[in-house]
């Protein structure tokens, strides 16, 4: 899997999970989240050559098309596969609220 | 939706469905498919600026992060959303076979 266990240990130009820490206040301008101050969002990036981690039949055909026709510009793209939620603490007035924000953390990637 | 109805009618630099006809023999080197000779596979391409058809909470956050930090390289990517199957006719010896290949045709796109 193109996850942290593999991608953070290997220098990889191809599609892989990349580390990204987002500070809510500095990076997003969000002052309303009390905890955490930021989180490891991560992101997916890198080339999708030669059937690298192809996700669907279409991405496999597209990858094959690109492999055979290298001048083509219709290549698959490196995107998130598995995502996890993030639990945050914020306040409405003086009332603390705990919320789980879905699909906030990327855990693995694919070529799609 | 970033589908043919919208994308094929508008000149769009942002993420959109793009037409791509694949000729099985010429483009993939496949001689074994009897019918069809090729098909409209289509593909997704284009930029994913702030909130352009963002797919998940993470792609929305990433999009916002990129807007606030334009030097960042962690942008969402334009990929397939809805896919459809393709029915093919081929032969095993002299016996005709009809097969439905799943996820062969892209119908719409998203920023993920």
């Amino acid at each position: 899997a193109l996850d942290a266990a593999y991608c953070f240990r290997n220098v990889q130009d191809n599609c892989c999970l990349r580390p990204l820490y987002i500070d809510f206040k500095r990076d997003l301008g969000w002052k309303w989240i009390h905890e955490p101050k930021g989180y490891n969002a991560n992101f997916c990036a890198g080339a999708c050559p030669y059937l690298w981690s192809s996700d669907t039949q279409h991405s496999r055909v597209l990858s094959l098309y690109n492999t055979i026709n290298p001048e083509a510009s219709a290549s698959p793209c490196c995107v998130s596969q598995d995502l996890e939620p993030l639990t945050i603490l914020y306040y409405i007035g003086k009332t603390p609220k705990i919320e789980q924000l879905s699909n906030m953390i990327v855990k693995s990637c694919k070529c799609s | 939706a970033l589908d043919a109805a919208y994308c094929f009618r508008n000149v769009q630099d942002n993420c959109c469905l793009r037409p791509l006809y694949i000729d099985f023999k010429r483009d993939l080197g496949w001689k074994w498919i009897h019918e069809p000779k090729g098909y409209n596979a289509n593909f997704c391409a284009g930029a994913c600026p702030y909130l352009w058809s963002s797919d998940t909470q993470h792609s929305r956050v990433l999009s916002l992060y990129n807007t606030i930090n334009p030097e960042a390289s962690a942008s969402p990517c334009c990929v397939s959303q809805d896919l459809e199957p393709l029915t093919i006719l081929y032969y095993i010896g002299k016996t005709p076979k009809i097969e439905q290949l799943s996820n062969m045709i892209v119908k719409s796109c998203k920023c993920s």
Epitope: Q57, I68 | L28, K31, W32
Partner: nanobody, 114 residues
């Protein structure tokens, strides 16, 4: 069900040659592609070369050194590897994609070392 078995791996010195073979058995039809992939320790499996009915393609790092060939009558796939380099060291896998389903052989070890 398709079965694949590779052979021809071994230890070779840098600059040397090896020929890998793959025998496919079972009902072979609707082949998207047949190919050779490799996996070095701690790395992802990567494509080396693929063959469709009348096209071949190679990863950049092996172009001009490796040649893939297919014998449809015998259901075999071969990979002629010349001018081998230490970075070619890996387990090499034969792959057949039939109507979108991948079939893999168990792999054969290729070690390039002096």
């Amino acid at each position: 069900q398709v079965q694949l078995v590779e052979s021809g791996g071994g230890l070779v010195q840098p600059g040397g040659s090896l020929r890998l073979s793959c025998a496919a058995s079972g009902s072979i039809f609707g082949v998207f592609y047949m190919g050779w992939f490799r996996q070095a320790p701690g790395k992802q499996r990567e494509m080396v070369a693929i063959s469709t009915d009348d096209r071949t393609s190679y990863v950049d790092s092996v172009k001009g050194r490796f040649t893939i060939s297919r014998d449809n009558a015998k259901n075999t796939l071969a990979l002629q590897m010349n001018s081998l380099k230490p970075e070619d060291t890996a387990v090499y896998f034969c792959n057949l994609n039939q109507l979108g389903t991948d079939y893999w052989g168990p792999g054969t070890q290729v070690t390039v070392s002096s």
